[in-house]
Interface confidence: medium
């Protein structure tokens, strides 16, 4: 596969991953709680997320309440908020860096500097995935640990929510996409040394492996 094709595939995966990460961040199903005790007969399930908690009635009606105070939130929720939002914002930055370094755009000159810009975009997406993975795994670890902890009453046991699975899928896409973007700029077209300083200006765009690419001709 040519480096341009790798870049396009990588960018598509990263964009899908980014969308998935935003979805995971917004959804209330980070942990779910089902309990049919006497005092909540009408409740079918409870969801807890980073921004709100929801109760789903047996009728299918869902009522959600946004968390009032940040200070009242648990440490893991606060940390998960900060890290997930950081990952979403970093992915936004990575998008522009990747587009600047992409072979089909014209904002950076085609030479070696452009390869390093593209490589930076890939690395940012890779880091993005890792950054988002931290709160997801941390949250999941707490849920699983409490689920198997005999000292935690049944009425307080939660299960892993859909948002965590969506988040994991998103981080996988971000990391795979980031790797493909790095490949497009690195493996396929000369493998620039990451530590090598860029010593020249840059205006422009490329086709790294496209020796006699038909689109170049009149």
């Amino acid at each position: 596969m040519g480096s341009a094709a790798l870049e396009i595939l990588g960018l598509v995966l990263c964009l899908v991953g980014w969308g998935g990460l935003i979805l995971a961040c917004a959804l209330p199903q980070w942990r779910i709680y089902s309990y049919a005790g006497d005092n909540i007969v009408t409740a079918q399930a409870m969801y807890e997320g980073l921004w709100m908690s929801c109760v789903v009635q047996s009728t299918g009606h869902m009522q959600c309440k946004v968390y009032d105070s940040v200070l009242a939130l648990s440490t893991e929720v606060q940390a998960a908020r900060a890290l997930t939002v950081s990952a979403v914002l970093l992915a936004f930055v990575a998008l522009f860096v990747t587009l600047a370094g992409a072979q089909c755009t014209t904002c950076v000159a085609p030479g070696p500097a452009k390869a390093r810009v593209a490589l930076t975009g890939g690395v940012l997406y890779l880091f993005c995935g890792l950054l988002a993975l931290v709160p997801l795994c941390w949250f999941a670890n707490i849920v699983v640990r409490e689920f198997y902890d005999p000292s935690v009453p049944v009425s307080q046991k939660y299960e892993l929510g859909a948002a965590l699975y969506i988040g994991w899928a998103a981080t996988a896409l971000l990391m795979v996409g980031g790797c493909l973007l790095c490949c497009g700029a690195w493996v396929c077209t000369g493998r620039p040394d990451l530590s090598f300083p860029v010593k020249y200006s840059a205006p422009r765009r490329p086709t790294a492996t496209g020796d006699y690419d038909k689109k170049n001709y009149v």
Partner: antibody, heavy 119, light 107 residues
């Protein structure tokens, strides 16, 4: 069929300005970059500069202060202007297609034009 | 600037034998090296790009190898038409630079 052809004066007076034209056929300058390379008699090749497909330019530091590369996309021509010429600037001047890759090379070359700087 | 040193400066060969031309970079440039052939009174012609990638319309007897600082252009079974000067060029960083060339002579 891709072709590049250089044209310009064969003789230039010292301290004067050299103007060369590279006429490109079979390629669109909107999608292709063009470099200028020179070769003094009996010596090696020296990359002078490039005009990228988006119109941006890069120059070799050895000639940066004296060199200007421009283009006319409607005529599919690339121009080289080099001022303050000295006898050591006498060389064969080539224009070459430079694929817009991360690591540029030259896959199509003109036949070259010999420029002699002499009074 | 990255300096490319080609050796030997001149190489005498008999038709049919295989030869290796060397190009050494002043710093690691990965595989960002390209090889050209220039016959007398002609413009250069691209032979190999990115150290080892062959170019269409170029005879298969020309091959390239190497990575980092040391690169080699190999001609398997030299023919009389291969009498030329061979240049390596780096594109790892601007300015793009060429080696001083290796002149291939036929004995």
């Amino acid at each position: 069929q891709v072709q590049l052809k250089e044209s310009g004066p064969g003789l230039v007076q010292p301290s004067q300005t050299l103007s060369l034209t590279c006429t490109v056929s079979g390629l669109s300058l909107i999608r292709n970059s063009v470099s200028w390379i020179r070769q003094p008699p009996g010596k090696g090749l020296e990359w002078m500069g490039v005009i990228w497909s988006n119109g941006g330019t890069e120059y070799n530091s050895t000639v940066k202060s004296r060199l200007s590369i421009s283009r006319d996309t409607s005529k599919n021509q690339v121009f080289l202007k080099m001022n303050s010429l000295q006898t050591e600037d006498s060389a064969m001047f080539f224009c070459a297609r430079t694929p817009d890759g991360y690591y540029p090379y030259f896959d199509y070359w003109g036949q070259g034009v010999m420029v002699t700087v002499s009074s | 600037d990255i300096v490319l040193t080609q050796s030997p400066a001149t190489l005498s060969v008999t038709p049919g034998e295989s030869v290796s031309l060397s190009c050494r970079a002043s710093q690691g440039i990965s595989t960002s090296i390209h090889w050209y052939q220039q016959k007398s009174n002609e413009s250069p012609r691209l032979l190999i790009r990115y150290a080892s990638q062959s170019i269409s319309r170029i005879p298969s007897r020309f091959s390239g190898s190497g990575s980092g600082t040391d690169f080699t252009l190999t001609i398997n079974g030299v023919e009389s038409e291969d009498l030329s000067v061979y240049y390596c060029q780096q594109s790892y960083n601007l300015p793009l630079t060429f080696g001083s060339g290796t002149k291939l002579e036929i004995k």
